[in-house]
Each structure stands twice: as structure tokens, then as C-alpha cells.
């Protein structure tokens, strides 16, 4: 719900966007993920912090966890144990990478409303989780896994060679986290508990980068991070699996890898538990175009886990690399065998495919000239998927559902028609056996989140509606947008225009373009949002676009795998060829004309200002990529191959942002970056600086001293202060 | 510690109301349903019904026309009243309490109370 | 009303015995299945609840299984304290019902 536009008699009581309002987070949302626990029950944090679970079908709600108790050991976070006699209460949390951290925890009996004494857990934890059933726990500790058969149990230790960056079990690496997981866990209960999965990652042999982190002491210490840049030793991987009844039995039992997988360097890319005795790998090799489904079963006789090759699926681009960002995984049926798993069709669309014996024989379930994107859930008789289907756009998302049980199978789109303007960006989350469900929806206009009958899709009531940012943005000007697109050459590109308040088509604006533009991403969404360039077309009249061009997502294989093996040409080309195209629209004045992006975008940014064009005055570049020789090796090998002669060298070497600084001279160019990054490294900005110094070229820099790759805290609000000043003096715009 | 006790008159006579309280400490109102069942003589178990943390109630359709269970929380009380009794009502009165924790499962009874319907 | 039919209604088992209960219920219950266990003028105690579950402080030896309609309630060695009789419930649904009962003796 976007507030109405008001008649110019009403505009001296409304107010442009402040810088301030941004930075204070003034106009942030709310979304309501219901934390699940059964088919008809969730828990949630009540406003005063007690722990509430609400049975959607009695509409009764039960304090099981009060503030107090939370706040008796300054707890953040909680998790109920699944036979729901325990309670862990997570506090001390210390942020590692993106996703990982540490803790501290406690036991909490709700039987007894009394913490569990003796045999505490030791302290800091690395990763901790119930079982699926009933309240065993394990946990990493010092990069070795442990269990307990109860809370107040002696732990049992399972693995013993963890060692820090060098032997992980049970969590990630650096690379294993950020590139490949996207979790701080590696670690997989069986459906019943019976056996618990996991991961060791062997980093022994990869080089490590090493960074200063200065602190507040006399000498700086150094991080130093197992990070295989493109080319280098990989970590070596290794999947393990113990009966955790009898532990002690016959101990962890590795899972053997596909030969076809095994003959190379290769990736582990997820685990799926099938049932309590069948388990589904993934495995990828590391030129990533060829991915291996292996299905396992555990032998009683032997006590070890056979994955037979008539169970193998393998999953082969031509024309790219495998999967999109990453390559999906399957969603089993109740025959606990046959799987529905989203890949590419032959006309180069990702969608939906029901695998019953071989790849081969895949039955296609959704197809046409979109892409489905996530499966939610299979039931005996529906799946619930989100595509971006409706109406064309692809910067949209809806949930569908397809009814399996009858056939020919039939289609409802349970979200296109609910709340058609305001809601256009859909996601959700689902109890048990899809008995409830709820969707939260992300815009385009104020986002709210419903709670919905699983069988009749009926909504049943509204969970967060973010009345009081409604209540908030009545007297804001905020910009107007528009979500259009670009024919050119055979190609589409989808854009987003943010337009000042009073925007009149036959007055000139500056133009910034916000860009990110990676690989398999997409910037052009159908999603609510005020935040800094919406605060430049508000209050400073600035135009802002964000296009989506070759490489990016959602679109068909044509256009995501157009980029590959060649990083940095058409990504920066789309870029010019738009703002070309908005020129001609004859309300840009093309003498004011910007881009800035961060990191992948960061690096576009470079690249489009270093293009030679004479289109940009300015940019502005925040902890970009400089060199794919400097950048992890599961991503950048992904779309780029490896950096070797015999490979790809040659456009590692022509895609660097250094062989372009001549051409910076003239433009106005800002280059940002923490020095704490431990994900596109300071090096990455070192380089560009020392390149364009070599050159002699004149450029504008600023570091943030012990900040990593989000720039958080206090840094964010120098950062966009600075940005602002830097673009109001590019575009001469008064302060 | 947790703890519920039945109290209220042994004998009723038949065509009264049967009225029975249950009064209850060692545990938040807020977390907890409460159940009343009851068995009579050498019989088996049979439900009530109960009033949900939130004052709602829900009764077994046998006796619903028969039946009202209410609370007053700042007494830690609950109360069952059965109308138009006959001596098939005569019975072991419990009062129970469920909740979530236990997926609405019966976690601790009172001690009882026989209830006679008779002349 | 889902009907909860238990069988036997009585057994007789010696010291040391592994004990079976069976309970079937009318239509799915998933696994919202509970097990009570009452001694002569003694209000019944919760044993097992979700079908599976031990209550806090209840014995290993005893254990309950099963989903959807079939349902197991086992003492892995029988004791003398164990002498009661044993009740399934249903907590998926109101009204709540119990089955019939089934009284456990020593040989």
C-alpha cells in the first residue's frame, strides 16, 4: 500500500525524505515468519519479549518462556526442543562471517522451570541444534562435534582432529559458507534422529590470507583465513555419518563419493535426508557444469551407507555452468525415491521437473517463458512453489499450487489476485504438512504478512500489516517508480526507475544508476523499500535506475550464461546501452550522470566509468571487486573457469579494473572500502588505488578501518553521508 | 510445586446441579488449559471438557447441554457445574491440567473427588 | 467422536516380561496419542504423550510408538510397581476420548 498521492493544495504538509530519516532507519518493516513447531502451532516473540505459541486452530496462546527467564541470561535467542521439554536460550552471540557465529547457551527444563545443571555445555559454541525428534543435541565445539543424548547428559564426543583453520567438522570453512552452503552449519539430523550427517572440510594445504585488524591495542593483530582465491588448493572435503543411539558402535562412516565426481578436484554442495535410512549428496566438480544427485541407503548388515550408481543423477550444462546461483536441490515425494528438483528445460527456462528413475525420463511439471524459482513444499496431494510467472514480469514473485494427487495435475495461483497493487513480491513459509501457511509479501507496496488455511488457501488473519509505517509515510514525498523495460538487440532489459515527487518529463534530472549486476542476481523487484536512493530522488530530485542486463537471473539461460567465462563485458555493456536508452526518454540531463554499486556492482561501476563512453561524470565504487584472481574460487571459477593458460588467463587478465586506469582520468571517481573485509579483500581497492596512482590519475578514496564487506555500525552513516556529498558536488547540487 | 485439588459436596441429589471447584498453584494460568474428567465406579475415563487459557471452553457434545466449566484466575480457580444430574453421573471428579508442552496431553491431575447422585 | 479401541483388557505377565498394549484408533490421529497409567484410588499419571514421548521422570522401560490410527505402548521388563491399569487417549481432537483400559497383573 503505497500512500495516496495528494492534491498539490495538501503538498506544503508534506515533507521530502531526510538523509536522517534513512540512516535512523525511520521507515524500516516488519515481516512475521511464524517459527513453526507443528501443523497448527507457532512460537513467537512477543513485543515484551515472552515466548508465546499460538494453535491457530483452538486461538489459544501460551506464555511457555517468559522475559524474565530470557533476560536471566541475556538471551537473544531461543530454541524448543521437538518433544518441547527443553529450551535452549542462545546469548553472547559474536558474529564471525556472514552467517556464522558464536554463542553462548543454556539448557532450560519447562518441565521444572529450572535451568539444567551439570554437564553444562562448554563455552563458545560454534553451531547447536536439537534433533528432530525428541531432545537429543548436537553441537560443534573447537571445530569438533558432540552429542548428548539429553540436556543433562555427559557429551559424547564424536570427532576428535578439529583443529582452528585447519580441520573443520561440522561447520563450514570460509569458502564452504559464503559460496557454496550459505549456512554457518554442516550438519544434518535424519528425519527421526537416528543418524546425524555431517562435513569435515580439510583446509590443511590452502593459502590463507592475512589481514590487520587494529583495534585499540599497540600492535595490530592479523586475521588469517583459509581462502582459496580462484586457482588455488581447495578444501578437501569428506562426509561422514553416525548412528547416534549407539555412538560408540562402529563410530562415523564416510559416505563414498561418485567416481564420475572423484576423478577431479570436486564440491560438496548439500545433504537432504530422505528418510531415517536414506540420504541424498550432492556433489559438483569444480569446473562447475557438471553436478552428481547420489542416493544413499544404509546398510544394517554392514553398518555402512551404499549409494549405488543406478541412483546417481547427473546434471550437465552446455551452455554454463550447473543450477543458477546455486544448483537446486530436490524436494522427495512420499515414495521416499522419486524427487521434484527445479533445472533447466530445453528451452533454456529453469523450472520444475519430477524425477522419477532417471534424468533422463524427468517429467516436466511447470514450463513457458518464466522461470520457477523456489519449491516450498510437496503433500501427498499439492506442491507449493513461487515463480515469477504472472503477468510477465519478472521482478515479481507468486506462489502457486499444483495439485499432484489428480491428473492432469492443475495450477492455482494462490497470491496473483489477494492484494494485486500492493502486493506483487511473495514469499512463504509453511507448518506440517502444509496445514497453514504464511505469506509474507515484500511490496511493491507497504509489506504485510497473512496467515492462510493450507487446504482452502482461505486467509485466516493478518500477522504484521506495519500499520505504523502506513501511519508514518502519510506526510512523506516519496518518489514514484516504475518497473519498465528495454528491447535492444534481442535482448530485454528490465529496468526500475525512481522519479522525484514532483517528476515532469519536460524538465532535465541528474541520473544515477545503481548497479550490481552479478551473476544470477536481479536488482529490478517488485519490492517496497525507503531507503538511500529513495532519500535522492525525494529530497536531492535525482533520477535513479537500476537495470537488469545480461548475466542476471530469472529470465532464461540465454541471458544468465550469456556472461560466461567473461566476467565484466556485458554486464558494464548493458549498463551504457541503458542509459543511452534513458537519455533518449529526454528528461536526463546526460552532463550529470552517475553509477555507484557495491561489491560485484562496485566492480561494474569501475569498469562502466573506465569504459571510455564520456556517458558518466562520476561513480563511486564500495569494496569492489578489482581482479577475479583475487576472488574466491567456488564463485569466480563458477562463471570464469580457472585462471590457467590453458583456461581462461587471458580474460582474467583483460577483465581487471587496474588495465583500465587511464581511463579514469576523466571522470570523478570514489573508491570505498573496509579494511576488515574478509570477503572481497582490501587488496581488491589497494590495487585499483595503486594503479591509478601509477597512472597518475587523480581519484577520491576512503577506507573504514576494521569494517568488513557491510560496512556496518557508525561506518554505514559515514558512508552515506559521504556518498551524498560526493554526488551533490558531482551533480552541483547545493548542500 | 504443581499442584490441583477438587473440593465440593460428596453427595448431590438427583435433578440437582453437581458444582465442583478446582483450585490450582505451582504453575502460570497463561502456559495451561484445564481439563475436567471423570470415572465412575470400576468404569473407564471420560473427558469433560475444559477452558482454554484464553476463557474459552469446549465440552464433550454427551454432555454439553448439561455442562459449564469457567475460571477465575484471580483466585487460581476453576469451576464445574453439571445440571440435571442422575445417578449415572456419580462419579471420581478429576481436575487436570494440559497445554502445549504436552501436545494437550493430561500432565497432572488432582487427587479427585467423589461425587454420589442420590436420594 | 474418535473411538479408541484398546487391546488386551487385561493380561497377566510375569517379573521381567516385555509387555504390549495395542490401541487403534477410529480414523487418523496422527501421533497426538497418550499413555496413562493408573494405580487402585490413585488419579492416572501421564506416561508417554505425541505417542512417543517419555514425561519427565518416567522410566526407560516404558515406550510408546506409532501414527495415524495404530498405536503400541510397551514395558521392556515388567516390575512389580508396574501392577495399574494403563489408558490410551487421543489428545488430537475434542472431545478427547480414552480407551477402555487394560489392566496389567503379575503372574
Known amino acids: 500500500l503505497r500512500p495516496s498521492r495528494v492534491h498539490n493544495s495538501e503538498e506544503n504538509t508534506m515533507r521530502a525524505l531526510t538523509l536522517k530519516d534513512i540512516l535512523n532507519g525511520t521507515f524500516s518493516y516488519k515481516t512475521f515468519f511464524p517459527n513453526w513447531i507443528s501443523g497448527q502451532e507457532y512460537l513467537h516473540q512477543s513485543a515484551d519479549n515472552n515466548i508465546v505459541l499460538y494453535n491457530i486452530e483452538t486461538g489459544q496462546s501460551y506464555t511457555i518462556l517468559s522475559n524474565r527467564t530470557m533476560k536471566s541470561v541475556n538471551a537473544s535467542n531461543y530454541g524448543l526442543s521437538p518433544d518441547r521439554q527443553f529450551v535452549y536460550l542462545e546469548s553472547d552471540y559474536s558474529k564471525l562471517w556472514r552467517y556464522s557465529y558464536t554463542a553462548t547457551y543454556y539448557i532450560y527444563d519447562l518441565s521444572n522451570g529450572e535451568f539444567v545443571r551439570g554437564n553444562e555445555l562448554p563455552r563458545p559454541i560454534q553451531y547447536l541444534c536439537w534433533s528432530p525428534v525428541g531432545s537429543k543435541l548436537a553441537y560443534v565445539y573447537q571445530n569438533n562435534i558432540y552429542l548428548k543424548q539429553r540436556p543433562g547428559d555427559p557429551p559424547f564426543q564424536i570427532t576428535f582432529n578439529g583443529r582452528e583453520n585447519k580441520i573443520f567438522n561440522g561447520i563450514p570453512d570460509w569458502v564452504y559458507e559464503e559460496e557454496m552452503l550459505a549456512t554457518k552449519y554442516a550438519l544434518w539430523w535424519s528425519p527421526n534422529g537416528k543418524f546425524l550427517a555431517y562435513a569435515e572440510f580439510n583446509d590443511t594445504d590452502i593459502p590463507v590470507i592475512a589481514y590487520s585488524y587494529y583495534g585499540d591495542e599497540q600492535y595490530p593483530r592479523t586475521i588469517n583465513i583459509p581462502y582459496p582465491k580462484a586457482g588455488a588448493k581447495n578444501p578437501v572435503v569428506r562426509i561422514f555419518i553416525i548412528d547416534t543411539t549407539y555412538p560408540a558402535y562402529v563410530g562415523p562412516q564416510e559416505v563414498p563419493v561418485p567416481a564420475m565426481i572423484a576423478s577431479s578436484d570436486y564440491y560438496f554442495s548439500w545433504l537432504t535426508w530422505v528418510t531415517d535410512e536414506r540420504v541424498c549428496l550432492q556433489w559438483l566438480k569444480r569446473v562447475q557444469n557438471v553436478s552428481v544427485l547420489s542416493i544413499c541407503d544404509f546398510r544394517e548388515d554392514w553398518q555402512t551407507w551404499d549409494c549405488p550408481k543406478t541412483q546417481e543423477h547427473i546434471e550437465e550444462s552446455r551452455t554454463g555452468w550447473a543450477g543458477g546461483f546455486f544448483v537446486s536441490t530436490p524436494v522427495f515425494s512420499y515414495d521416499a525415491i522419486s524427487y521434484y528438483k527445479i533445472f533447466s528445460d530445453k528451452d533454456g527456462y529453469k523450472h520444475i521437473h519430477y524425477i522419477k528413475d532417471t534424468v533422463e525420463n524427468a517429467i516436466q511439471i511447470t514450463s513457458g517463458k518464466w522461470e520457477a524459482i523456489n519449491i516450498f513444499r510437496v503433500t501427498q496431494d499439492s506442491l507449493f512453489y513461487s515463480s515469477n510467472e504472472f503477468e510477465e514480469y519478472p521482478g515479481r514473485r507468486n506462489i502457486y499450487r499444483i495439485s499432484i494427487g489428480s491428473y492432469p495435475p492443475s495450477k492455482k495461483c494462490v497470491t496473483c489476485h489477494l492484494r494485486k497493487e500492493r502486493c506483487q513480491y511473495y514469499t512463504a513459509s509453511f507448518s506440517d504438512y502444509a496445514k497453514y501457511y504464511a505469506l509474507v509479501c515484500y511490496g511493491p507496496g507497504i509489506p504485510i504478512s497473512t496467515l492462510h488455511d493450507g487446504r482452502t488457501d482461505q486467509e485466516i488473519k493478518i500477522l504484521e500489516e506495519n500499520k505504523e509505517l502506513e501511519n508514518a509515510l502519510k506526510n512523506i514525498q516519496l518518489p514514484k517508480e516504475e518497473i519498465k523495460k528495454l528491447e535492444v538487440d534481442e535482448i530485454t532489459l528490465w529496468y526500475k526507475m525512481i522519479l522525484p515527487p514532483q517528476f515532469d518529463r519536460s524538465k532535465k534530472y541528474p541520473l544515477l544508476i545503481q548497479v550490481y549486476g552479478g551473476p544470477c542476481s536481479q536488482s529490478v523487484r517488485s519490492v517496497f523499500a525507503v531507503n538511500w536512493i529513495s532519500y535522492l530522488a525525494s529530497k536531492e530530485g535525482m533520477v535513479i535506475a537500476l537495470v537488469d542486463g545480461r548475466g542476471t537471473a530469472f529470465q532464461g539461460d540465454k541471458l544468465l550464461y550469456a556472461v560466461y567465462r567473461k566476467l565484466g563485458v556485458y554486464e558494464v555493456e548493458d549498463q551504457i546501452t541503458a542509459v543511452r536508452k534513458f537519455i533518449e526518454m529526454g528528461f536526463i540531463d546526460e552532463k550529470r550522470i552517475a553509477i555507484w554499486g557495491w561489491s560485484y556492482g562496485g566492480y561494474v561501476s569501475s569498469l562502466a566509468l573506465a569504459s571510455g563512453t564520456g556517458l558518466f561524470k562520476c561513480g563511486i565504487a564500495v569494496a569492489p571487486v578489482s581482479s577475479w584472481e583475487y576472488y574466491a574460487s567456488v564463485y569466480t571459477e563458477r562463471f570464469m573457469g580457472l585462471p590457467t593458460k590453458d583456461d581462461n588467463l587471458e580474460h582474467y587478465k583483460n577483465s581487471t579494473v587496474m588495465a583500465r586506469a587511464e581511463y579514469f582520468r576523466n571522470v570523478d571517481y570514489l573508491l570505498i572500502h573496509g579494511t576488515a573485509d574478509d570477503n572481497v579483500h582490501f587488496q581488491n581497492s589497494a590495487q585499483i588505488a595503486k594503479a591509478l596512482v601509477n597512472a597518475q590519475v587523480d581519484f577520491q578514496a576512503m577506507w573504514y578501518s576494521d569494517q568488513n564487506h557491510g560496512l556496518s555500525g557508525l561506518s554505514t552513516n559515514h558512508l552515506y553521508t559521504h556518498m551524498t556529498h560526493f554526488l551533490k558536488q558531482c551533480f552541483s547540487l547545493s548542500d | 510445586q504443581v499442584q490441583l485439588q477438587e473440593s465440593g459436596p460428596g453427595l448431590v441429589k438427583p435433578s440437582e446441579t453437581l458444582s465442583l471447584t478446582c483450585t490450582v498453584s505451582?504453575?502460570?494460568?497463561?502456559?495451561?488449559?484445564i481439563n475436567w474428567i471423570r470415572q465412575p465406579p470400576g468404569k473407564g475415563l471420560e473427558w469433560i471438557g475444559l477452558?482454554?487459557?484464553?476463557?474459552?471452553?469446549n465440552y464433550n457434545p454427551s454432555l454439553k447441554s448439561r455442562v459449564t466449566i469457567s475460571k477465575d484466575t484471580s483466585k487460581n480457580q476453576f469451576s464445574l457445574k453439571l445440571s440435571s444430574v442422575t445417578a449415572a453421573d456419580t462419579a471420581v471428579y478429576y481436575c487436570?491440567?494440559?497445554?502445549?508442552?504436552?501436545?494437550?496431553?493430561?500432565?497432572?491431575w488432582g487427587q479427585g473427588t467423589l461425587v454420589t447422585v442420590s436420594s | 467422536d474418535i473411538q479408541m479401541t484398546q487391546s488386551p483388557s487385561s493380561l497377566s505377565a510375569s517379573v521381567g516380561d516385555r509387555v504390549t498394549i495395542t490401541c487403534k484408533a477410529s480414523?487418523?490421529?496422527?501421533?497426538?496419542v497418550a499413555w496413562y497409567q493408573q494405580k487402585p484410588g490413585k488419579a492416572p499419571k501421564l506416561l508417554i504423550y505425541?505417542?512417543?514421548y517419555r514425561y519427565t521422570g518416567v522410566p526407560s522401560r516404558f515406550s510408546g510408538s506409532g501414527s495415524g490410527t495404530d498405536f503400541t505402548f510397551t514395558i521392556s521388563s515388567l516390575q512389580p510397581e508396574d501392577i495399574a491399569t494403563y489408558y490410551c487417549?487421543?489428545?488430537?481432537?475434542?472431545?478427547?476420548?480414552f480407551g477402555g483400559g487394560t489392566k496389567v497383573e503379575i503372574k
Open positions: 505451582g504453575f502460570s494460568l497463561t502456559n495451561y488449559d
Open positions: 487417549q487421543q489428545h488430537y481432537s475434542n472431545p478427547r476420548t
Open positions: 487436570v491440567r494440559g497445554g502445549p508442552l504436552v501436545w494437550y496431553a493430561l500432565d497432572y
Open positions: 480414523q487418523d490421529v496422527s501421533t497426538a
Open positions: 505425541s505417542a512417543s
Open positions: 477452558i482454554w487459557t484464553g476463557g474459552g471452553t
